[in-house]
């Protein structure tokens, strides 16, 4: 079941998922000057069964002017630079990452993809937050948000994270642990 809204926004923080539950949609968005091809789904879908899940449909972008660039290749390094600074979209394809049953990994980039990925998450999905470059994480609890179903409506839990203007970015699960942070700080409900 799809979550009704997007995960909470935290000032100076971004979020990502370690893996995506079946039923998750990833919009096929293209960078400026390009648009989705006219045939094919407007999104990729995490689909499969308990033993194996994968992304169904492939996103393809074509030039808004000339309608001939529909190749699906990994972007060149200079194209990659246009991605978000944390490269959140492709970080999780790590060799040591354990595959979760009923989940998909981060899909690989497609040519001329937009800089930000737009996901439609499903109930039970967890996303993890980290502070952007130049900001340090202060925690009073987990820096994560879970989409939950309550009384027939979906809601995201509030991540217990605040990002202060210091130097080191915090890490996602599985990466090196950041410096200890003080407890007892208020929640942040502001947006990026």
């Amino acid at each position: 079941e799809l979550c009704d809204d997007d995960p909470p926004k935290i000032t100076h923080a971004t979020f990502k998922a370690v893996a995506y539950k079946e039923g998750t949609m990833l919009n096929c968005e293209c960078k400026r000057g390009f648009r989705r091809i006219k045939s094919g789904s407007p999104y990729m879908l995490c689909t499969g069964n308990s033993s194996h899940s994968s992304w169904d449909n492939q996103c393809q972008c074509t030039s808004s002017a000339a309608r001939n660039t529909t190749k699906q290749v990994t972007p060149q390094p200079e194209e990659q630079k246009e991605r978000k600074t944390t490269e959140m979209q492709s970080q999780m394809q790590l060799a040591d990452q354990v595959s979760l049953p009923g989940h998909c990994r981060e899909p690989p980039p497609w040519e001329n993809e937009a800089t930000e990925r737009i996901y439609h998450f499903v109930v039970g999905q967890t996303v993890y937050y980290q502070c952007v470059q130049g900001y340090r994480a202060l925690h009073r609890g987990p820096a994560e948000s879970v989409c939950k179903m309550t009384h027939g409506k979906t809601r995201w839990t509030q991540p217990q994270l605040i990002c202060t203007g210091e130097t080191e970015p915090s890490q996602f699960p599985g990466e090196e642990e950041p410096q200890a942070s003080p407890d007892g700080l208020p929640e942040s409900e502001t947006s990026r």
Epitope: L2, D4, D5, D6, G23, M25, N27, E29, R32, R35, K38, S39, G40, S41, P42, Y43, L45, T47, D56, N57, S64, A114, E116, I118, H120
Partner: antibody
């Protein structure tokens, strides 16, 4: 909670134009396409087109090119559809939709009558 | 344009029954099909996306199936509030198109 609030019913003369609105709330307006759908009694639902407010891209059903013009104002999180050279065939309920058709506005009834 | 045919314009059923609404596409649309419910005087409500995935808040008595050209919306244990018209839609290619609708009547 996601909401799409559409403007009220319109009674318009043949040959004129009408502009209806769809105000989005409860999600990031610039992240998702807004689509428009026409419904007339005794006819199939018809997809008119869609617009991406973030990049101001739009796609149109060939049938509605020249008839419908889609725009969006990101400052007010509002999408608009203008219908021109109206005839009785344009009398219908028009819906806006968002987030891959998951959410629909309440519809705007357009009646074209002399 | 891709044509979606809902061959049965009306279906009659009783509370507690199981009913299947079918939709046939004129060409392969993969699983890029959605189902909507529209009650009299209301906007369409999204039930199913990608042929078989339920939207949040949709009772689990609604299930979607199919791929390619043949799709089915099944309502098991029909309730009186299911009295409505049901539409399929393909979004595999522009222009997106809808089926003609199937009206469910409760005996």
């Amino acid at each position: 909670q996601v909401q799409l609030q559409q403007s009220g019913a319109e009674l318009v003369r043949p040959g004129t134009s009408v502009k209806m609105s769809c105000k989005a709330a409860g999600y990031t307006f610039t992240n998702y396409w807004i689509g428009w759908v026409k419904q007339r009694p005794g006819h199939d639902l018809e997809w008119i087109g869609d617009i991406h407010p973030g990049g101001d891209y739009s796609n149109y059903n060939e049938k509605f090119k020249g008839k419908a013009t889609l725009t969006a104002d990101t400052s007010s999180s509002t999408a608009y559809m203008n219908l021109s050279s109206l005839t009785s065939e344009d009398s219908a309920i028009y819906y806006c939709t968002s987030r891959n058709f998951a959410y629909w506005g309440q519809g705007t009834l357009v009646t074209v009558s002399a | 344009d891709i044509l979606l045919t809902q061959s049965q314009k009306f279906m009659s059923t009783s509370v507690g029954d199981r009913v299947s609404v079918t939709c046939k596409a004129s060409q392969n649309v993969g699983t890029n099909v959605a189902w909507y419910q529209q009650k009299p005087g209301q906007s369409p409500k999204a039930l199913i996306y990608s042929a078989s995935y339920r939207y949040s808040g949709v009772p689990d008595r609604f299930t979607g199936s199919g791929s390619g050209t043949d799709f089915t919306l099944t309502i098991s244990n029909v309730q009186s509030e299911d009295l409505a018209e049901y539409f399929c839609q393909q979004y595999n290619s522009y222009p997106y198109t809808f089926g003609g609708g199937t009206k469910l009547e409760i005996k």
